[in-house]
Structures are given as structure tokens and as C-alpha cells.
Interface confidence: medium
């Protein structure tokens, strides 16, 4: 086993150079020292290692670090960062935004989304901010990842990105998320008036309170239903018919098509059936005539 | 892009009749929500009625109710707004719009017909 072997004598090298590519992994295994590969990382970049002595590199790296690089050395890392998995950086204390940045460059079109994710969510975790040079050097990763950081990473993520939010980048957040999220875009967008403001907002509206949409309705956003099905069913319930018509607009006309799916369904069952009738729109679903809820999930008939 | 143009406006007294029509032209408008709107004079622009791009759902102002009838051929790319028992205060230039998403972006809008109750 290559673990048993000691280094053949004269073989120990003082550096990173050439000569240790005609190595045989056995040897780099026996011989390198993980400490001097981390002062000299640069020659390791430099120098046409094959891919299984980079790999050999790096177990020494592992073994000399185990709980996870020093920032030293990550700030030199620059594409050896390819061959180190999400689950390392996770281990990782990054603070500089400057080391973000280099590796993110590294890292483009390297197919190394989950890397780079886990790098920012490492930084942010240190206490770094995201500011939107970061969000370019993530390139073409869409922001979904937004969803992968941690609510307390999500607190370190300034406003500013906000802008920066795309319709489907949302779409696998949960709850708590979108709620954290929401709040962030309501400060991002606070300068912004009228329905340029509403077309702004309308990504995040899933994290929305009753209480918002209840603000919201008073604007005439004519919100479509693409939109309104996306809002969280807790807050969509204490909408009133006459709430709900005026956050929709026209766009009501479109509640018939989503009455037996979900959010839809949820909202027409806790409303009174003659005051859906008033919509002429055909809904069904409410409660009916003469009933009574007593309970938030039960209906009583009058007795 | 879509262009949308109004016709069938005019003068008719209380208690009348007038079918407005609205022809699309530029590309086809069979996948729009189509509605109309109206503007009187020194009011806001307040919804009529709405028919979804199916043609199977409608949407009418309580003012309009059992009077207004809204309609679409989307092979002719046209919506229609059949008016009857008009009043006076169904006088307003009428406005037809087109919408894929929310009426608040990618609105296309007509220039408008005027039409006029006289008691």
C-alpha cells in the first residue's frame, strides 16, 4: 500500500518543480509534504501535473488540513479550486472578497455551480457581503442558490441583489425564504413607484403577508394569475372576494380555469358562495348559504 | 407587437343598442385576454368586461351586468362588446386591450371609439 512506503532516500523534494512530474504517485504519495504544497501554490498551478498527481495533491492538503484550508491558502488556490468538492469549502473560513472573486473566475464555465455556491454561502456565513460584483462573477449561474444559502446567510445578502432576481430563480424556496427574501426586495424597491414597483415586487410576492397583499390591492396592480398562484395559501386565504377582485383586475376572469388547483381551491373554500356568485364567473366551491364557520377548518351548519 | 383598432362607436338614444368590435392586426391575439374599458369624461379608466384567451370565462362590471355582452373570434384575430339597454351613463370613449400576462405590462391598447347616450 502506498501509505506503508517511505520516501526513497534523495527523493524528499525542498519544492515545487518539474522533476516532481516524473514521480511515481507512489512517491508523491511517500514524499510531498502537504505544507509546502500550500506556500508554493502557485508552481502546483503552473506546472503540467497530471490530473491523478493533482489528485494526490490534494489528499496531502486534505490530510495536512482536516478541518478545512486556512484562508492563506485559499486566496492562492487559483485552478487547483477545480478539484475540490462543495462538501471542502463548506469547511472553509473565507472572509476576503477579493479570494471570492478570483476563485469564482476560476471556476466559470467549469460546469461548478455547486462549488461556487458553496463558496459565496461560506463567505457570507463568515460575514462577508454579497455587493453585485459578485453576483456578475457568478455569472450565468441562475440565482436560484439564493434558495441554498441558509436563512442567517440570506440576512448578509444585501438588497441590492434584488434586482438582479428572476421570475424562475425563486420558484424552489421555501417558505421562510421567500418570506426573508420579500422583505429584502420591499427595501431594495422602496424608491420605486407605481406599477414599475409592482412589476419589481411581483417575483418575491410568494414571501408576502394578508397584510401586504391587502396594501396591494389598494393599486390597481391588476396582478396576473401566473403571479397570484405563486402567493403562499396562508396569506391568500384571508383575502376577502371583493380584495381578491381588486388585486386581480381583469385578470379575475382567470380564477376559473385554477378553481380546482391549489392555491385557487384554497381560497374559494373559505369564502362565502353567494359572494362568489356575485362575480359571475361560474366559481364554485364556497360555503354555502346559511353556514356558519366556527372553525378555521371546520364548517357548521346553523341547527 | 399588436395593434388593436375600434370600431362601432357613435350616438344612439337611451335604451339602444351598439355592437363595438375590436380587430387585432400584427400578430395573432388568440392566446390574449381581451378586454374593454371605458374613460368618461374627467373620470379614471375603469374596466367593462374581460373574455380569457379560451373564450370560455367572462368578466363583467357590476354597472354592465345582464346589458353587456363580451365576445371573441380568434379566428378573425376580434373581440367584440354587444351593449344593449344603454343609459346615459354608459357614455365614454371605450378602449380595447390585449394581455398575455398582467394588465400592468405587455398591455397592448387601442385608440379608442367614443360612444354616446343621449336621454
Known amino acids: 500500500d502506498a501509505e506503508q512506503k517511505a520516501c526513497p532516500p534523495g527523493k524528499e523534494p525542498y519544492k515545487v518543480d518539474e522533476d516532481l512530474i516524473f514521480y511515481q504517485n507512489w512517491e508523491l504519495e511517500a514524499c510531498v509534504d502537504g505544507t509546502m504544497l500550500a506556500r508554493q501554490m502557485d508552481l502546483v498551478n503552473e506546472i503540467p501535473f497530471t490530473y491523478e498527481q493533482l489528485s494526490i495533491f490534494k489528499h496531502k492538503l486534505d490530510k495536512t488540513y482536516p478541518q478545512g484550508y486556512p484562508e492563506s491558502l485559499i486566496q492562492q488556490l487559483g485552478h487547483f479550486f477545480r478539484y475540490v468538492s462543495p462538501e471542502d469549502i463548506h469547511q472553509w473560513n473565507v472572509t476576503s472578497p477579493d479570494t471570492v472573486k478570483t476563485l469564482l473566475k476560476v471556476s466559470k464555465g467549469q460546469k461548478m455551480n455547486a462549488q461556487a455556491i458553496a463558496l459565496v454561502a461560506c463567505y457570507l456565513r463568515g460575514g462577508g457581503q454579497l455587493d453585485e460584483d459578485m453576483v456578475k462573477a457568478l455569472g450565468d449561474i441562475p440565482l436560484s442558490y439564493l434558495c441554498d444559502f441558509s436563512p442567517q446567510d440570506l440576512h448578509s445578502v444585501p438588497s441590492s441583489v434584488m434586482w438582479l432576481v428572476g421570475p424562475q430563480d425563486l420558484d424552489k424556496c421555501s417558505q421562510r425564504h421567500l418570506g426573508l427574501l420579500y422583505q429584502k426586495a420591499c427595501s431594495a424597491f422602496q424608491n420605486v413607484s407605481g406599477l414599475e414597483y409592482f412589476e419589481k415586487i411581483k417575483t418575491f410576492l410568494g414571501g408576502a403577508s394578508v397584510k401586504d397583499l391587502r396594501a396591494l390591492s389598494q393599486h390597481n396592480v391588476s396582478m396576473d394569475i401566473a403571479t397570484f398562484k405563486r402567493l403562499q395559501v396562508d396569506s391568500l386565504v384571508g383575502l376577502s372576494v371583493a380584495e381578491v377582485q381588486k388585486l386581480l383586475g381583469p385578470n379575475i376572469v382567470d380564477l376559473k380555469t385554477e378553481e380546482d388547483k391549489s392555491p385557487v381551491r384554497d381560497w374559494l373554500f373559505r369564502q362565502h358562495q353567494k359572494d362568489l356568485d356575485r362575480l359571475g364567473l361560474g366559481l364554485q366551491g364556497g360555503i354555502p348559504n346559511g353556514y356558519l364557520v366556527l372553525d378555521f377548518n371546520v364548517r357548521e351548519a346553523f341547527s | 407587437q399588436v395593434q388593436l383598432v375600434e370600431s362601432g362607436g357613435g350616438l344612439v338614444q337611451a335604451g339602444g343598442s351598439l355592437r363595438l368590435s375590436c380587430a387585432a392586426s400584427?400578430?395573432?391575439?388568440?392566446?390574449?385576454?381581451m378586454a374593454w374599458f371605458r374613460q368618461a369624461p374627467g373620470k379614471e379608466r375603469e374596466i367593462v368586461a374581460v373574455i380569457n384567451w379560451t373564450g370560455g370565462s367572462t368578466y363583467y362590471a357590476e354597472s354592465v351586468k345582464g346589458r353587456f355582452t363580451i365576445s371573441r373570434d380568434n379566428p378573425k384575430n376580434t373581440v367584440y362588446l354587444q351593449m344593449n339597454s344603454l343609459k346615459p351613463e354608459d357614455t365614454a370613449v371605450y378602449y380595447c386591450?390585449?394581455?398575455?400576462?398582467?394588465?400592468?405590462?405587455?398591455?397592448?391598447w387601442g385608440q379608442g371609439t367614443q360612444v354616446t347616450v343621449s336621454s
Open positions: 400584427g400578430r395573432t391575439v388568440s392566446t390574449y385576454n
Open positions: 386591450a390585449a394581455t398575455r400576462t398582467s394588465w400592468t405590462e405587455n398591455t397592448y
